[in-house]
Amino acid sequence: FAPVPRLTWEHGEVGLVQFHKPGIFNYSALLMSEDKDTLYVGAREAVFAVNALNISEKQHEVYWKVSEDKKSKCAEKGKSKQTECLNYIRVLQPLSSTSLYVCGTNAFQPTCDHLNLTSFKFLGKSEDGKGRCPFDPAHSYTSVMVGGELYSGTSYNFLGSEPIISRNSSHSPLRTEYAIPWLNEPSFVFADVIQKSPDGPEGEDDKVYFFFTEVSVEYEFVFKLMIPRVARVCKGDQGGLRTLQKKWTSFLKARLICSKPDSGLVFNILQDVFVLRAPGLKEPVFYAVFTPQLNNVGLSAVCAYTLATVEAVFSRGKYMQSATVEQSHTKWVRYNGPVPTPRPGACIDSEARAANYTSSLNLPDKTLQFVKDHPLMDDSVTPIDNRPKLIKKDVNYTQIVVDRTQALDGTFYDVMFISTDRGALHKAVILTKEVHVIEETQLFRDSEPVLTLLLSSKKGRKFVYAGSNSGVVQAPLAFCEKHGSCEDCVLARDPYCAWSPAIKACVTLHQEEASSRGWIQDMSGDTSSCLDKSKESFNQHFFKHGGTAELKCFQKSNLARVVWKFQNGELKAASPKYGFVGRKHLLIFNLSDGDSGVYQCLSEERVRNKTVSQLLAKHVLEVK
């Protein structure tokens, strides 16, 4: 299990910027416009534009309320007029440089509209949002805009019983079959497009990946066994001519594995996914947050998957097929029969074109019938190193974003920002042999779940934005200035931070910073370069005989142990003479002349089997 976060920042301790509007709730849709330095926020019955550099500065707002008539009709169907029968913004996607595509639940009558960014007004198009946005604000959803077409995963009907992955397109709309083997009570988590690799084979297609958790069809248990999935469709899909007409011909899905090797610990509920794309990476990496299905202990894990691993399952893996054996417990088994050509579920690539299959519309019926009946792959997608990057106890992770940053020595590190269901943000760096949880920041005053996380990755200014029911919080990627000494700065093992001996401060590293000469940073936590020992100041105290003295010591690191020394000997709390307050401050009882002298408070922190010792406080005590 990962260690506790080294540092804990309370809500008011660090520089967080907040945005919320009284009476507005459910700030669950965030969209960044890097070029405009604007963050768009979709909430209940409202959309806001705020300054991305300081989100407390509101630029625009527009309200999208439900009429009383609609509310009443919704309430007649058994829904709550005060909560469910409102308009929850669920889709907030860029349409052009001057407009956004926005969809809301609209009192169980999902509706979409275009938001003009110049006037910040809706155009009043009121398109049917069915299949693009859920009816029920409690139902899962995901969407991504690809080339002006919305790809969505949501529920298609009022009851929420009909799942759908669709492409909303004027010339070639597509959807999944409404069939249990295709989607079985899915909970949609994330969708994104992966563009064809520039060095990949000619004529490749862009692909859209959907991540969700669904009820297993391949295993039967006494309870509903949930399975995390990745599904994939091709951007160039146009459906079939007869079989799979206006349906995906490229829809395939596979199981995501995230488990601790040689243990029964299986993480099968997908919470969130982030696609890491970075100049130094040869291919995108999917980072995913999981929790176990029976999570009575509060466990969470992060697994990472390479695009190549995912692609290999879809392009070369075996398929599963429904077993019609009566009383069979494994209803789905590996299909070992002949696979039609072209390969079912494959995108139309140069190979297919060479065989005269220029579009999915002229794929042979055998291929289409096969993919219709075999949407599930037998092979599973395994994580990098076949194990989670991080397993954390006593926490329920909700969302993740990942930044790849360069340390002072030129090494690249993946830094994960993972939110919790109690309003906190954990920041963890992936080191060679371990994951170091740098810090935990309480983003929200109340312990409320973080609903959405967004990373702004503009060079020179990077922020994490978190949305919850009550508002949005903007946090810098690091609080370097909070590390008061060189040792603290280095022990943080934060790739964004380095100690500047010139100004005797822990500073934020900017990739384009030129004047970083002489700065100190060591990702192994080696503080031996910290030469400028801070000037030793001390506190002088005078106490009366027989009294009790309390000597303060402030230690921030959760990984360090506080040690008190008197006349160079370590003081133990077991003695009736001494007591500790909060494992930090020292109490000395029944004072006598022998208690006069110098008391030192030190912090001892083990980093990579080495103990780093720091003097935190020095007290000179005189008993009169």
Epitope: K130, G131, Y156, N157, F158, L159, S161, E162, S166, N168, P173, L174, R175, E177, Y178, A179, I180, P181, N184, E185, V215, V217, K224, K246, S322, A323, T324, K331, K372
Partner: antibody, heavy 118, light 111 residues
Framework: QVQLVQSGAEVKKPGSSVKVSCKAS????????MHWVRQAPGQGLEWMGQ????????SYNQKFKGKATITVDKSTSTAYMELSSLRSEDTAVYYC???????????WGQGTTVTVSS | DIVMTQSPDSLAVSLGERATINCKAS??????????MNWYQQKPGQPPKLLIY???NLESGVPDRFSGSGSGTDFTLTISSLQAEDVAVYYC?????????FGQGTKLEIK
């Protein structure tokens, strides 16, 4: 071949309950949603609700919420519909029907007549 | 709920003649170019039988004298040449939006 065989006719007293069964054969039971439709004497067809046999997740027409309970037993490939607090207006023929990919009822049970009379 | 209204309520057509039944939905039953409208035939003492799905697709095993057309809110079932065995009640049904609803039925008889 694909078949849905329903239980026999029932005569029930007002206030009582009845459980109608629908046994599927000739196809993979868990791969298709099962729906229930009712037809009152001399009347048209009314959709009551559906069930996902894999998960047991049922959803109902608002009109029949609290009246009908749909369940499945995967081990016997059987769907059930229980009607509670029976009244004379519940007298009808009840059909189970398989919901196919194209969003239509392609196979129907033969129907079960439930008569509610004192 | 979407209300389906069939016309006429009953229809008498001579053998070999064309029979046309209309169905009007209170709101569109289309989604992204697909019409979720189905037609069923029910004979006395029997369950309904699927004839046409998705407005115009003929169910396998159904004679090709049956055809369906229409989109949006207006749909038609046509029997090109009525046969004696076609005497039955015909129902339209939408599956675009729950609750799924049926028309009141059209009784087709021989003139």
């Amino acid at each position: 071949q694909v078949q849905l065989v329903q239980s026999g006719a029932e005569v029930k007293k007002p206030g009582s309950s009845v459980k109608v069964s629908c046994k599927a054969s000739g196809y993979s039971f868990s791969d298709y949603y099962m729906h229930w439709v009712r037809q009152a004497p001399g009347q048209g067809l009314e959709w009551m609700g559906q069930i996902n046999p894999t998960t047991g997740g049922a959803s109902y027409n608002q009109k029949f919420k609290g009246k009908a309970t749909i369940t499945v037993d995967k081990s016997t490939s059987t769907a059930y519909m229980e009607l509670s607090s029976l009244r004379s207006e519940d007298t009808a023929v009840y059909y189970c029907a398989r919901y196919y990919y194209g969003r239509h009822f392609d196979v129907w049970g033969q129907g079960t007549t439930v008569t509610v009379s004192s | 709920d979407i209300v389906m209204t069939q016309s006429p309520d009953s229809l008498a057509v001579s053998l070999g003649e064309r029979a046309t039944i209309n169905c009007k939905a209170s709101q569109s039953v289309d989604y992204d170019g697909d019409s979720y409208m189905n037609w069923y035939q029910q004979k006395p003492g029997q369950p309904p039988k699927l004839l046409i799905y998705a407005a115009s697709n003929l169910e396998s095993g159904v004679p090709d004298r049956f055809s369906g057309s229409g989109s949006g809110t207006d749909f038609t079932l046509t029997i090109s040449s009525l046969q004696a065995e076609d005497v039955a009640v015909y129902y339209c049904q939408q599956s675009n939006e729950d609750p799924y609803t049926f028309g009141q039925g059209t009784k087709l008889e021989i003139k």
